[in-house]
């Protein structure tokens, strides 16, 4: 089982849309795949895929999940808010026929405030 996640870095404006993609590949067929998205280590959702369908379509605040055969799991955040900023990781595990798991690399999401003055203040607040 292998998981490739993208993009590595995503910068979007508050109120717009962010799309994170996870490609899940397995050399042999699977009956049930457990998937999980985390943000800063906290679980956003943990549905499974069987018979070509997700058991859950919602993933965290304003998050929608979709599965496009053969291998693409998409997390769409819409509308994006400032507190969506963080480090997202996609994880997958084949539960049937036999357990095998893998996870992607981090996608870092940066959300810019809609108000440019907020943006300047936020950047100025970083040390150094």
């Amino acid at each position: 089982l292998s998981v490739q996640q993208g993009p590595n870095l995503l910068q979007v404006r508050q109120g717009s849309q962010a799309t994170l993609v996870c490609q899940v590949d397995q050399a042999t067929a699977w009956e049930r795949l457990r998937v999980k998205w985390t943000k800063d280590g906290a679980i956003l959702c943990q549905p499974y895929i069987t018979n070509g369908s997700l058991s859950l379509g919602v993933c965290g605040p304003q998050g929608r999940l979709s599965w496009q055969a053969p291998s693409h799991l998409t997390l769409q955040l819409d509308p994006v808010s400032l507190n969506h900023s963080g480090a997202y990781v996609c994880w997958a595990a084949v539960e049937i026929p036999e357990l095998e798991e893998a996870e992607g690399n981090i996608t870092r999401l940066f959300v810019d405030p809609d108000d440019p003055t907020q943006n300047r203040n936020r950047i100025a607040s970083f040390p150094g």
Epitope: L1, S2, D25, Q26, A27, T28, A29, W30, E31, L33, I49, T50, N51, G52, A69, P70, S71, P97, E100, A102
Partner: antibody, heavy 120, light 113 residues
Framework: QVQLQESGPGLVKPSQTLSLTCTVS??????????WSWIRQFPGKRLEWMGY???????SYNPSLKSRVTISRDTSKNQFSLKLSSVTAADTATYCC????????????WGQGTMVTVSS | DIVMTQSPDSLAVSLGERATINCKSS????????????LNWYQQKPGQSPKLLIY???TRLSGVPDRFSGSGSGTDFTLTISSLQAEDVADYYC?????????FGDGTKLEIK
């Protein structure tokens, strides 16, 4: 590009253990998503998948070989090996190593194969 | 184990004519999760290792001539060579990767009539 080369004795006595090594060049056997298999072809041309070792060291074997087969690896030498115990004349075949990926689930690169005869 | 049954065992076709090789699996190789058939076709010429022609039942590997095509779904699959060339003389094998153990068909020997 990736190349595979089998090595080992061409003659093995009945009841002994057949040992072969596949040396991989141009690619790391530890690369995520890749599987390293042993496949044999009998004199009558029939192909049999024997088993694989994956990028993490996990193995899967053909149940038809019961507990006679073991596949291991040496990442420092970028090699993986086959051991087949208690051989008989029926194990006489050309033994090939091959690689397959999660994303493209087919044997895309094969070694040239090495003929092994089991005879006293 | 999934049993792969190929037919015919051997086939003689005139140059420029169509060659058709069949492969039947003992259970379905289609997955609704991935929308794929887990079936590959290989060509093996004398003294060489097998070479992949078609994967996922119908996807031709880059560099493979377009006279080779794969079709079928579930349990019944076909490899077609639309216009046989001299260099196509070889043994052809189907192989599934639906589950382990991976298994091959017994092969079809293709010759020129």
């Amino acid at each position: 590009q990736v190349q595979l080369q089998e090595s080992g004795p061409g003659l093995v006595k009945p009841s002994q253990t057949l040992s072969l090594t596949c040396t991989v060049s141009g690619f790391s056997i530890s690369t995520s998503g890749y599987y390293w298999s042993w496949i044999r072809q009998f004199p009558g041309k029939r192909l049999e998948w024997m088993g694989y070792i994956n990028y993490g060291g996990g193995t899967s074997y053909n149940p038809s070989l019961k507990s006679r087969v073991t596949i291991s690896r040496d990442t420092s030498k970028n090699q993986f090996s086959l051991k087949l115990s208690s051989v008989t004349a029926a194990d006489t075949a050309t033994y090939c190593c091959a690689t397959m990926a999660d994303r493209f689930a087919f044997f895309d690169v094969w070694g040239q194969g090495t003929m092994v005869t089991v005879s006293s | 184990d999934i049993v792969m049954t190929q037919s015919p065992d051997s086939l003689a076709v005139s140059l420029g004519e169509r060659a058709t090789i069949n492969c039947k699996s003992s259970q379905s190789l289609f997955s609704s999760n991935t929308n794929r058939n887990y079936l590959n076709w290989y060509q093996q010429k004398p003294g060489q290792s097998p070479k992949l022609l078609i994967y996922h039942a119908s996807t031709r590997l880059s560099g493979v001539p377009d006279r080779f095509s794969g079709s079928g779904s579930g349990t019944d699959f076909t490899l077609t060579i639309s216009s046989l060339q001299a260099e196509d003389v070889a043994d052809y094998y189907c192989q599934h990767h639906y589950e382990t153990p991976l298994t091959f068909g017994d092969g079809t020997k293709l010759e020129i009539k």
